[in-house]
């Protein structure tokens, strides 16, 4: 009779994490008598995975009934596979011996590869806000995937970015891997509604990549532009001065009126109007009683936006051009901001 051979028909098996791996093994003969053992790896450091005769192997089940006299199928199933189970598995036939069984024949080995999905990419931006024309960095991280091959792309509003650096760790071998990428993005004034997207493609995702997003509204600060204008009022001794605060983001803004350098009124932007690009406009006005002034008045609109140093715009009010009203000593009326959208 021909000598027993141990057949492992599958050179490799690919299993998704969490699933069950089937490792096939058959013997070509019932002789010699003796048990089968499964090992991961070879040589003196090999690891026993299953022993037909003794031991407790809770994750391993046999495909067929090994207690049947004429059984020659020694295939096993390993449940709840993790990336740590990857390796080459050998089905080894032992010959009955005294006192110990003797290794007789080994199969050629089956390489078990484990696929694990990457975690959802997490995109994070800079800690502090930045203004248009500045370059900011965004990071994207995803973990726990196997095999190591992975593709990462960056997009801004659907347009692919090219200025980024990506690392997959560790450099050497591991049961699973992580990816870390940093992209540089140049901010524009129109970026309040913009999104930065990190897209990760991996063999486990069946062509449906995972995406992580960051809204540039969390990152950008658009400083306001100021315009101070003077409008005539029906009452001859009064002038209405408006300060138009345009195209700012975020909304946090405080405005102070100064008359000849002295604080006249401070207010916080409340009812603002939103532009299509996500920035805000706001207008504040000041009613100045020119008859209270002997000399020309320097009116200053000073704006502190989002905790940044104040910016200001001044307007010189010529008193000599207006008739004086006797007995009035009020410099300016404490009027609120104009809530109408002037655009």
């Amino acid at each position: 009779e021909e000598e027993l051979q141990v057949i492992q028909p599958d050179k490799s098996v690919l299993v998704a994490a969490g699933e069950t791996a089937t490792l096939r093994c058959t013997a070509t003969s019932l002789i010699p008598v003796g048990p089968i053992q499964w090992f991961r790896g070879a040589g003196p450091g090999r690891e026993l995975i299953y022993n037909q005769k003794e031991g407790h192997f809770p994750r391993v089940t046999t495909v067929s009934d090994l207690t049947k006299r004429n059984n020659m199928d020694f295939s096993i199933r390993i449940g709840n596979i993790t990336p740590a189970d990857a390796g080459t598995y050998y089905c080894v036939k032992f010959r009955k011996g005294s006192p110990d069984n003797v290794e007789f024949k080994s199969g050629a080995g089956t390489e078990l590869s484990v696929r694990a999905k990457p975690s959802a990419p997490v995109v994070s931006g800079p800690a502090a806000r930045a203004t248009p024309q500045h370059t900011v960095s965004f990071t994207c991280e995803s973990h726990g995937f196997s095999p190591r091959d992975i593709t990462l792309k960056w997009f801004k509003n659907g347009n692919e970015l090219s200025d980024f650096q990506t690392n997959v760790d560790p450099v050497g071998e591991s049961v699973s891997y992580s990816i870390h990428s940093t992209a540089k993005v140049v901010l524009t004034r129109e970026d309040v509604h913009s999104q930065v997207i990190c897209e990760v493609a991996h063999v486990t995702l069946q062509g449906d990549p995972l995406r992580g997003t960051a809204n540039l509204s969390e990152t950008i600060r658009v400083p306001p532009t100021l315009e101070v204008t003077q409008q005539p009022v029906r009452a001859e001794n009064q002038v209405n001065v408006t300060c138009q605060v345009r195209k700012f983001y975020p909304q946090r803004l405080q405005l102070t009126w100064l008359e000849n350098g002295n604080v006249s009124r401070t207010e916080t932007a409340s009812t603002v109007t939103e532009n299509k690009d996500g920035t805000y406009n706001w207008m504040s006005w000041l009613l100045v009683n020119v008859s209270a002034h002997r000399d020309d008045v320097k009116l200053t609109c000073q704006v502190e936006h989002d905790g940044q140093p104040a910016v200001s715009k001044s307007h010189d009010l010529k008193v000599s051009a207006h008739p004086k009203e006797q007995g009035s000593n009020t410099a300016a009326e404490n009027t609120g901001s104009n809530e109408r959208n002037i655009y």
């Epitope: 790896g41 070879a42 040589g43 003196p44 450091g45 390796g87 024949k105 080994s106 050629a108």
Partner: antibody, heavy 122, light 112 residues
Framework: QVQLQESGPGLVKPSETLSLTCTVS????????WSWIRQPPGKGLEWIGF???????FYQSSLKSRVTISLDTSKNQFSLKMTSVTAADTAVYYC????????????????WGQGTTVTVSS | DIVMTQSPLSLPVTPGEPASISCRSS???????????LDWYLQRPGQSPQLLIY???SRASGVPDRFSGSGSGTDFTLKISRVEAEDVGVFYC?????????FGQGTKVEIK
Amino acid sequence: QVQLQESGPGLVKPSETLSLTCTVSGGSIRDYYWSWIRQPPGKGLEWIGFIYYNGRTFYQSSLKSRVTISLDTSKNQFSLKMTSVTAADTAVYYCARVRAYSGIGLDGTDVWGQGTTVTVSS
Amino acid sequence: DIVMTQSPLSLPVTPGEPASISCRSSQSLLYSTGYTYLDWYLQRPGQSPQLLIYGGSSRASGVPDRFSGSGSGTDFTLKISRVEAEDVGVFYCGQALQTPLTFGQGTKVEIK
């Protein structure tokens, strides 16, 4: 193809610890044994020990109390630490890859580093 | 430990002529699976050893076919069918059946 590169100090003082690192490039650490072998000046080869990719270690019994071999798969490196060195530990130290395809034995030390000379002297 | 003994320890050779090195192990290197755990190495002057033969008779990748290994159990032979100048160096046999791995003392091959 796979290449091995030893690194570490060339001179170690008696009673101190010898530390060497071997960097594996161009290949997989999985399914192989990673060995340290030394050769004293003008003498033959002496196996120090090896580590399997699963972390299991095997040492020369006469050196076991002084030797530790460790593996860092994340960096594709393995290391040798030998404590309490004496002049008798002066040798060329080789790192090497040992194959294992099936069964209990091994299938030849098929890749060797170029070797690093370690002198134990005060 | 398995003791490996080589002979001769020195072998003067003539280029183009055959050469033979013997290696004996203190216990059988033939495993129950039928595999022989005996390897041959060549260490050229100033170089690292290189694997020539594994499993008693299988040539390693890139090794010229003038090198052949034979033997079983405890007695093994490395043959060079036609020695070339580049074959000078020290030849070692080694066993890989069990730890510790052990090597022979080496056979120094030099041109006559």
